[in-house]
Interface confidence: medium
Amino acid sequence: EDELQVIQPEKSVSVAAGESATLRCAMTSLIPVGPIMWFRGAGAGRELIYNQKEGHFPRVTTVSELTKRNNLDFSISISNITPADAGTYYCVKFRKGSPDDVEFKSGAGTELSVRAKPS
């Protein structure tokens, strides 16, 4: 079995304020079992943007149906972008663990920049 890769193909994405930003991420394998999470920033201070397993993220929608069997697309769309949303977003695969899931692999990150809303 090939080793899992987390693919974030875009180095950067630029979106006008008020629009939606699509951040693309795919896994190359279903193994190991465990959830996907999206974070803004890296390290201890990173901000959770989306958790596949639990939580309420009203501005985030998944691009494909994550519950679909064999789905490998974990792209998200964030609505109503503001300048405060700028930063680097990481798609992170976790391995199912007990009691806590363990971070397994991160994508290379996609930098979101926000342009002023066209007047």
Epitope: D2, E3, Q5, V6, I7, Q8, P9, K11, R24, A26, M27, T28, S29, A42, L72, D73, S75, T88, K105, S106, G107, A108, G109
Partner: antibody, heavy 120, light 112 residues
Framework: QVQLVQSGAEVKKPGSSVKVSCKAS????????ISWVRQAPGQGLEWMGG????????NYAQKFQGRVTITADESTSTAYMELSSLRSEDTAVYYC?????????????WGQGTTVTVSS | DIVMTQSPLSLPVTPGEPASISCRSS???????????LDWYLQKPGQSPQLLIY???NRASGVPDRFSGSGSGTDFTLKISRVEAEDVGVYYC?????????FGGGTKVEIK
């Protein structure tokens, strides 16, 4: 183990188009990129573009923009590279390879190559 | 586009002796995640290229341990600790940090 099998050699006239196929077998196809790399006789390697089938959209090296089209058919695990407005300088061996810009593991599987000769 | 420059162009080697190939990039291949997005490939005569090293220093599956990659940022080296006859061919470095992927011009390794 994943294998990439390419279509056979082609001889084309200047100004025409060629479409090369690359069929994957033995592993996941959808979320790996398929890149296309060419090698002119006696020359080095040149990346033309690539596609991640699960996303559908391809990206291309500027040099080939407007002349190359890369597509993928998830149902048959096959990627295609079509190059139009052929000229003699396009005579080369065209390779497909599994690997993606910003992927972790390099282009780890390569097709056997397809020789395209452009001659009047 | 990122420009990749390899040296030497040609490298005559003696079996059993070490060999070293240099690769320079026009901008840093070191990502904030700590990885260098630099791969090494070998194209043996009449064959498709094969992956040797990924992420700067990681040997690909099935690659003998006499091959090693090192370096960071813009300067990278591929070393063969003891060259064998089967190692002849053209070696290419390639940056994988951003599109378009770009290759070095190649280093031809041949037996003296």
């Amino acid at each position: 183990q994943v294998q990439l099998v390419q279509s056979g050699a082609e001889v084309k006239k200047p100004g025409s188009s060629v479409k090369v196929s690359c069929k994957a077998s033995g592993g996941t196809f959808s979320s790996y990129a398929i890149s296309w790399v060419r090698q002119a006789p006696g020359q080095g390697l040149e990346w033309m573009g690539g596609i991640i089938p699960i996303f559908g959209t391809a990206n291309y090296a500027q040099k080939f923009q407007g002349r190359v089209t890369i597509t993928a058919d998830e149902s048959t695990s096959t990627a295609y590279m079509e190059l139009s407005s052929l000229r003699s300088e396009d005579t080369a061996v065209y390779y497909c390879a599994r690997g993606v810009p910003r992927g972790d593991l390099g282009m780890d599987v390569w097709g056997q190559g397809t020789t395209v000769t452009v001659s009047s | 586009d990122i420009v990749m420059t390899q040296s030497p162009l040609s490298l005559p080697v003696t079996p059993g002796e070490p060999a070293s190939i240099s690769c320079r990039s026009s901008q840093s291949l070191l990502h904030s995640n700590g990885y260098n997005y630099l791969d090494w490939y070998l194209q043996k005569p009449g064959q498709s290229p094969q992956l040797l090293i990924y992420l700067g220093s990681n040997r690909a599956s099935g690659v003998p341990d006499r091959f090693s990659g090192s370096g960071s940022g813009t300067d990278f080296t591929l070393k063969i600790s003891r060259v064998e006859a089967e190692d002849v061919g053209v070696y290419y470095c390639m940056q994988a940090i951003e599109s378009p992927l770009t290759f070095g011009g190649g280093t031809k390794v041949e037996i003296k």
